[in-house]
C-alpha cells in the first residue's frame, strides 16, 4: 500500500523498482496531480483490508444546507509514499485534496515525525476552485538533503473542528557510511590483546566494516557493523583505520595510533636547589613516560669519599612534583645523586649523576666542665668551660653562646651572649639579686649552633651575702647539675 | 566444534577436470573466508589464494590465477575447488582453511589427494 | 611477495630438549603464524599473531619476534611434537610459507 520512489540512474518502469510498488526516479518533483490536469491516481487498497479502496484519515461532512444529499467523505489524495534520493539532492512532494467550495478558511498544515513544521520551510499551498469543488495541492520542497531530513513527512487539514490527515511520505536520504562510533588511540602493553570499535550507519544499509593495521587489511571478509576487532597483541606502535562499505561507496574513519607502553626514559637536568649541612633539595626534568603514567621516584644518594663504603642510600618519592629533599645527610660531604623514575611497566634507567655538597654542620656536642661562680664582687657571675671536641663535618669553631635565666619571685628572664672562639671563660653582669641564674653554653660553628650544655645554677643572695662556691657540671653519670651557694 | 570435511581422493587423466568441494560445519559459513592450499608430493604449503564467503567473490594468487575457479553453494555451507586442463604437475594434496582476520588459517579440511597421471 | 626462510630445514633432537626454530621474512611483516603438520595429516594451528597460542596447544610451544625475525620455541620436546613446521606471514598478500622445518627424533 506504499509506493515508492527510488533515485536511479537508470531507465525503468513507473511503478516496478526494485521492492513490489516501488519507484525508482531520479525526479526531483513528485507530484500528485489534481485531477482537472487528466491524470487519474491509481486506486490504492489498505495493506489490512485487501480490496477495500484505503481512504486514510477522512472527515465525513455534514448534509448539504439543502439537507438532500451527503458530499463524499473528504481525503487527501495517495501519492507516493516512499522517495529514496541520495545526500545533497532537491526534493519536492505533495498532498492533495478537494474540498467542497461550502468549506471556508482551509489551511494545510506540514509534519515531520509528529511535530509541525513551521518557519523556514518551502511549503506552497495552491488552490484550484471549481464550481462545486477547490482542488487543493500543498506542496513542500527541500534543497540538498541531509540525513537529518530523513522521516515520515504528513500534511494535516482542519474543517468544521475535524482533522483529515494525508498519508505519510516517508523521505529516506540515502548516502555515504556516516561513523557513530570510530576507534580510538590507545596505550597498550606489548604483546597484549586489546579492542578497537567501530560502529557507522546508512543508509542504505547494510554497512560492511573491514580493519585495516598499517596500510593491510585485517579482515578481508567484511563484518556487519557495529565490529569489534580483538588485535591480538603488537609489539610496535601501528596505526589502525575502519573503512565502513554500503552500496553508495566508502567511508573512512580517521587513522588512530596505538602505542606499546615501555618503560621510561631517564630523567634529565638534575639539579641541586638548596644544599644545607644535612639536607639537599633537587629537582629533576622527567623523561618520556614510555605511553604509561609515572607512578613513583627513586632519588639515589652514593657519598663521594675514599673511605665510604660505596653503599647507596635509595629514596623513594612521588612523581610529581619533580622535587625531592634528600635528607640524613653527613654535613660538610661530597655526594653522587641520579634520579629514575617508573611507570607500570618497570624503572628507567638513571640520570646522569651529578655532584652535591652538603654545607658545614653544627656541632654536635657541647663544651664541657662547665663552672660558675660569683666574683668577689657580686656584680658578675664568672662562667668558665672547656672547648668540645667537635668533628671535622661540624666545621671550624666561631665562638660559643651563652643562655642565662634569671628566676626571682615569679619573675624570668632569658639572656643571650656570644662570645669568640679562642674564649673558655666569661663574665656576666648580675642581672637580680635573690634569685637563681641558669647557665648554658653552645658551640657555634658557620653550620649552626650545637647543643647546649646541661644547665648549671647558681643562687645570688641578696645584698651583704658573701659566697664564692662554684657550681659546676656535674662529673659524666650524675644524675642533676649540683648548685653550690 | 568447527568442522572441515572435503570430498575424497581423485585420480584424473591429463586434460581433464577435477572439482574438490569443501563442506563447513558448526559455524557461520558466511561469516568466514574459505582459502585454498596446496602440497605437492614431498612439498611445503603453498596458498592459492580465498573466496569471500559473504559476496561469493573469488580471489587468486598469481600463480593459480589460470585454471583453478573457487566457488560456493552456501546453502550447504560447501566451497568448491575446480581445476581444469589438469596437468602432472597438478598432483598434489589441497586443502581447504577457514580464512580468519591476520590471515590466520584456524581450521582446516583433511585433504584432498588429487593424482593426474595418464 | 615476501619470502620465507626457515632455519634449520631439518633438525634431530630428544625428548625432554628445548628447540627453536628461526623464520626469516625478507622484508618486514606484521604478524607470524605457526603451524605444525604430522605426516598424511592437515596442517594444525599451533601459533597465531606471532605469540599467541591457539586453541588446545600445550603451554611448552612459545613464539616471539617481530619486523623480519621470529622464533619458535619448544620447550622440553615431548614424543608426539616431532612433526613439520611451518612459519606464514601476515601483512603482505599474497600470504607466503616458509619451507618447513622437519623436526626428528635423535
Known amino acids: 500500500a506504499i509506493t515508492e520512489a527510488r533515485e536511479e540512474a537508470k531507465p525503468y518502469p513507473l511503478f516496478p523498482g526494485p521492492l513490489p510498488g516501488s519507484l525508482q526516479t531520479d525526479h526531483t518533483s513528485l507530484l500528485s496531480l489534481p485531477h482537472t490536469s487528466g491524470y487519474q491516481p491509481a486506486l490504492m487498497f489498505s495493506p489490512t483490508q485487501p480490496g477495500r479502496p484505503y481512504t486514510g484519515n477522512v472527515a465525513i461532512p455534514r448534509v448539504t444546507s439543502a439537507g438532500s444529499k451527503l458530499l463524499p467523505p473528504l481525503a487527501f489524495k495517495h501519492t507516493v509514499g516512499h522517495i529514496i534520493l541520495s545526500e545533497h539532492k532537491d526534493v519536492k512532494f505533495n498532498c492533495s485534496i478537494s474540498v467542497p467550495n461550502i468549506y471556508q478558511d482551509t489551511t494545510i498544515s506540514w509534519w515531520k515525525d509528529g511535530k509541525e513544521l513551521l518557519g523556514a520551510h518551502h511549503a506552497i499551498t495552491q488552490f484550484y476552485p471549481d464550481d462545486e469543488v477547490t482542488a487543493i495541492i500543498a506542496s513542500f520542497s527541500i534543497t540538498s538533503v541531509q540525513r537529518s531530513d530523513n522521516g515520515s513527512y504528513i500534511c494535516k487539514m482542519k474543517i468544521n473542528n475535524e482533522e483529515i490527515v494525508s498519508d505519510p511520505i516517508y523521505i529516506e536520504v540515502q548516502g555515504l557510511p556516516h561513523f557513530t562510533k570510530q576507534p580510538e588511540s590507545m596505550n597498550v602493553t606489548r604483546n597484549t590483546a586489546f579492542n578497537l570499535t567501530c560502529q557507522a550507519v546508512g543508509p542504505p544499509e547494510p554497512v560492511n566494516i573491514f580493519w585495516v593495521q598499517n596500510s593491510s587489511r585485517v579482515n578481508e571478509q567484511p563484518e556487519k557493523s557495529p565490529s569489534v576487532l580483538t588485535v591480538p597483541g603488537l609489539t610496535e606502535m601501528a596505526v589502525f583505520s575502519c573503512e565502513a562499505h554500503n552500496d553508495k561507496g566508502l567511508t573512512v574513519s580517521k587513522g588512530v595510533q596505538i602505542n606499546i607502553k615501555a618503560i621510561p626514559s631517564p630523567p634529565t637536568e638534575v639539579s641541586i636547589h638548596n644544599s644545607t649541612a644535612h639536607s639537599i633539595l633537587i629537582s629533576w626534568v622527567p623523561g618520556f613516560d614510555g605511553y604509561s603514567p609515572f607512578r613513583n621516584c627513586s632519588v639515589q644518594v652514593k657519598e663521594v669519599d675514599p673511605l665510604s663504603n660505596g653503599s647507596v642510600m635509595i629514596f623513594n618519592t612521588s612523581a610529581s612534583p619533580h622535587m625531592y629533599q634528600i635528607k640524613q645527610l653527613q654535613a660538610l660531604a661530597n655526594y653522587s645523586i641520579g634520579v629514575s623514575c617508573m611507570n607500570e611497566i618497570g624503572w628507567s634507567a638513571v640520570s646522569p649523576w651529578i655532584l652535591a655538597s652538603t654545607t658545614e654542620g653544627a656541632p654536635s656536642v657541647a663544651p664541657l666542665n662547665v663552672t660558675v661562680f660569683l666574683n668577689e664582687s657580686r656584680d658578675n657571675v664568672d662562667i668558665r668551660w672547656m672547648k668540645p671536641l667537635t668533628k671535622r663535618q661540624a666545621g671550624e669553631l666561631v665562638g660559643y653562646r651563652i643562655s642565662h635565666v634569671w628566676q626571682s619571685a615569679g619573675i624570668s628572664k632569658e639572656l643571650l651572649e656570644e662570645v669568640g672562639q679562642n674564649n673558655s671563660r666569661a663574665q656576666i653582669s648580675v642581672q637580680v639579686h635573690n634569685a637563681t641564674c641558669t647557665v648554658r653554653i653552645a658551640a657555634v660553628t658557620k653550620g649552626g649552633v650545637g647543643p647546649f650544655s646541661d644547665p648549671v645554677k647558681i643562687f645570688i643572695p641578696a645584698h651583704g651575702w658573701v659566697d664564692h662556691a662554684p657550681s659546676s657540671t656535674p662529673a659524666p653519670g650524675n644524675a642533676d647539675p649540683v648548685l653550690i651557694i | 566444534q568447527v568442522q572441515l570435511v572435503q570430498s575424497g581422493s581423485e585420480l584424473k587423466k591429463p586434460g581433464a577436470s577435477v572439482k574438490v568441494s569443501c563442506k563447513a560445519s558448526s559455524y557461520t559459513f558466511t561469516t568466514y573466508g574459505m582459502s585454498w592450499v596446496r602440497q605437492a608430493p614431498g612439498q611445503g604449503l603453498e596458498w592459492m589464494g580465498w573466496i569471500n564467503t559473504y559476496s561469493g567473490v573469488p580471489s587468486y594468487t598469481d600463480d593459480f590465477k589460470a585454471r583453478f575457479v573457487f566457488s560456493l553453494d552456501t546453502s550447504v555451507s560447501t566451497a568448491y575447488l575446480q581445476i581444469s586442463s589438469l596437468k602432472a604437475e597438478d598432483t598434489a594434496v589441497y586443502y581447504c582453511?577457514?580464512?580468519?582476520?591476520?590471515?590466520?588459517?584456524?581450521?582446516w579440511g583433511q585433504g584432498t589427494l588429487v593424482t593426474v597421471s595418464s | 611477495d615476501i619470502q620465507l626462510t626457515q632455519s634449520p630445514s631439518f633438525l634431530s633432537a630428544s625428548v625432554g630438549d628445548r628447540v627453536t626454530i628461526t623464520c626469516r621474512a625478507s622484508?618486514?611483516?606484521?604478524?607470524m603464524h605457526w603451524y605444525q603438520q604430522k605426516p598424511g595429516k592437515a596442517p594444525k594451528l599451533l601459533i597465531y599473531?606471532?605469540?599467541n597460542l591457539a586453541q588446545g596447544v600445550p603451554s611448552r610451544f612459545s613464539g616471539s619476534g617481530s619486523g623480519t625475525e621470529f622464533t619458535l620455541t619448544i620447550f622440553s620436546l615431548q614424543p608426539e611434537d616431532f612433526a613439520t613446521y611451518y612459519c606464514?606471514?601476515?601483512?603482505?598478500?599474497?600470504?607466503?610459507f616458509g619451507q618447513g622445518t622437519k623436526l626428528e627424533i635423535k
Open positions: 606464514q606471514q601476515w601483512g603482505s598478500l599474497p600470504f607466503t
Open positions: 599473531a606471532t605469540s
Open positions: 582453511a577457514r580464512y580468519t582476520n591476520y590471515g590466520v588459517f584456524d581450521y
Open positions: 622484508s618486514s611483516v606484521g604478524y
